[in-house]
């Protein structure tokens, strides 16, 4: 977590601020979707647990030519110690669930939330 | 519109337990926490605990660690607060109240937004 | 635990008068996120708490511009700017910062 904030970024980024960044960047998403996110892409549903940044990438890795998303897929790839490619999946997927790419950002975004606010940044 | 609507008062011998229920309504349990907080006749208020119903984390005061227990249902959106080894001093109203968040600012923690009515829990022999 | 106190324990006031409610917390209250999670509560007889601000001086939504928060660190204080006839009734500050959270143990305003 010594590198975030992405590449204009001076220096080492707090582990606090690098949360409060992604959390802003999926307001953004929330905030600016007219259309339906990622033309109403699918996803596999993750469990909000210890590892889910990576799991969560896994998930959003899968889901290409969708600009909006992209910067959280970079920003998310910063929180997960390794690398991660398409068709990736850990046991933190629940490969039975598929949601829109909408609400697995509303879910994650809320998650990121309480995190936020009980100090969990890691 | 968002309601916290508790269950009725209850009398209470010392050392039984209590259960107090709080249905919501006009919003979603798991996008909040739900806490508990007491008043014991003519005195302040007191936070007792909370719990996050998208996972069930407690967070409790010690004094209380051991005999309460706050639980929410999310399928009915309900969360409830458990005391036991009641004792006279445990008479007050409980009171429960939710704690959320909106989609449209990155940092919108809107403290305890909205309450029950009170619950009056008489421990009396 | 942080000890929130307040002063003065009672109040008494007019109708449009300026009331300063203070708070100190028996340490520092900023939460590691870098917020300070003070709130300000108003209750009245027989009734819940209504939230009035959060995080020191945000309006929570609905309340009157006249009540406004302000502070940092360790001392905080309520203001209402012109008392109305509804406003008599106990405030209460609140940290949630620092498991556990703690109210301070009121203060009643009541008509001169």
């Known amino acids: 977590l010594t590198c975030l904030g992405g590449f204009a970024s001076p220096g080492p980024v707090p582990p606090s601020t690098a949360l409060r960044e992604l959390i802003e960047e999926l307001v953004n998403i929330t905030q600016n979707q007219k259309a339906p996110l990622c033309n109403g892409s699918m996803v596999w549903s993750i469990n909000l647990t210890a590892g889910m940044y990576c799991a969560a990438l896994e998930s959003l890795i899968n889901v290409s030519g969708c600009s909006a998303i992209e910067k959280t897929q970079r920003m998310l790839s910063g929180f997960c110690p390794h690398k991660v490619s398409a068709g990736q999946f850990s046991s933190l997927h629940v490969r039975d669930t598929k949601i829109e790419v909408a609400q697995f950002v509303k879910d994650l975004l809320l998650h990121l939330k309480k995190l936020f606010r009980e100090g969990q940044f890691n | 519109q968002v309601q916290l609507v508790q269950s009725g008062a209850e009398v209470k011998k010392p050392g039984s337990s209590v259960k107090v229920s709080c249905k919501a309504s006009?919003?979603?349990?798991?996008?909040?926490?739900m806490h508990w907080v007491r008043q014991a006749p003519g005195q302040g208020l007191e936070w007792m605990g909370t719990i996050d119903p998208a996972n069930g984390n407690t967070k409790y005061v010690p004094k209380f660690q051991g005999r309460v227990t706050i639980t929410a249902d999310e399928s009915t959106s309900t969360a409830y607060m458990e005391l036991s080894s009641l004792r006279s001093e445990d008479t007050a109203v409980y009171y429960c109240?939710?704690?959320?968040?909106?989609?449209?600012?990155?940092?919108?923690?809107?403290?305890?937004?909205?309450w029950g009515q009170g619950t009056l829990v008489t421990v009396s022999s | 635990d942080i000890q929130m106190t307040q002063s003065p324990s009672s109040l008494s006031a007019s109708v449009g008068d300026r009331v300063t409610i203070t708070c100190r917390s028996s340490?520092?209250?900023?939460?590691?996120?870098?917020?300070?999670?003070l709130e300000w509560y108003q209750q009245k007889p027989g009734k819940a708490p209504k939230l009035l601000i959060y995080?020191?001086?945000d309006r929570f939504s609905g309340v009157p511009s006249r009540f406004s928060g302000s502070g940092s660190g360790t001392d905080f204080t309520l203001t209402i700017s012109s008392l109305q006839p509804e406003d008599f009734a106990t405030y209460y500050c609140?940290?949630?910062?620092?498991?556990?959270?703690?109210f301070g143990q009121g203060t009643k305003l009541e008509i001169k």
């Open positions: 109240a939710r704690s959320i968040y909106d989609d449209y600012h990155a940092d919108d923690y809107y403290a305890m937004d909205y």
């Open positions: 340490q520092n209250i900023v939460h590691i996120n870098g917020n300070t999670y």
């Open positions: 995080k020191i001086s």
């Open positions: 609140f940290q949630g910062s620092h498991v556990p959270w703690t």
């Open positions: 006009g919003f979603y349990i798991k996008d909040t926490y």
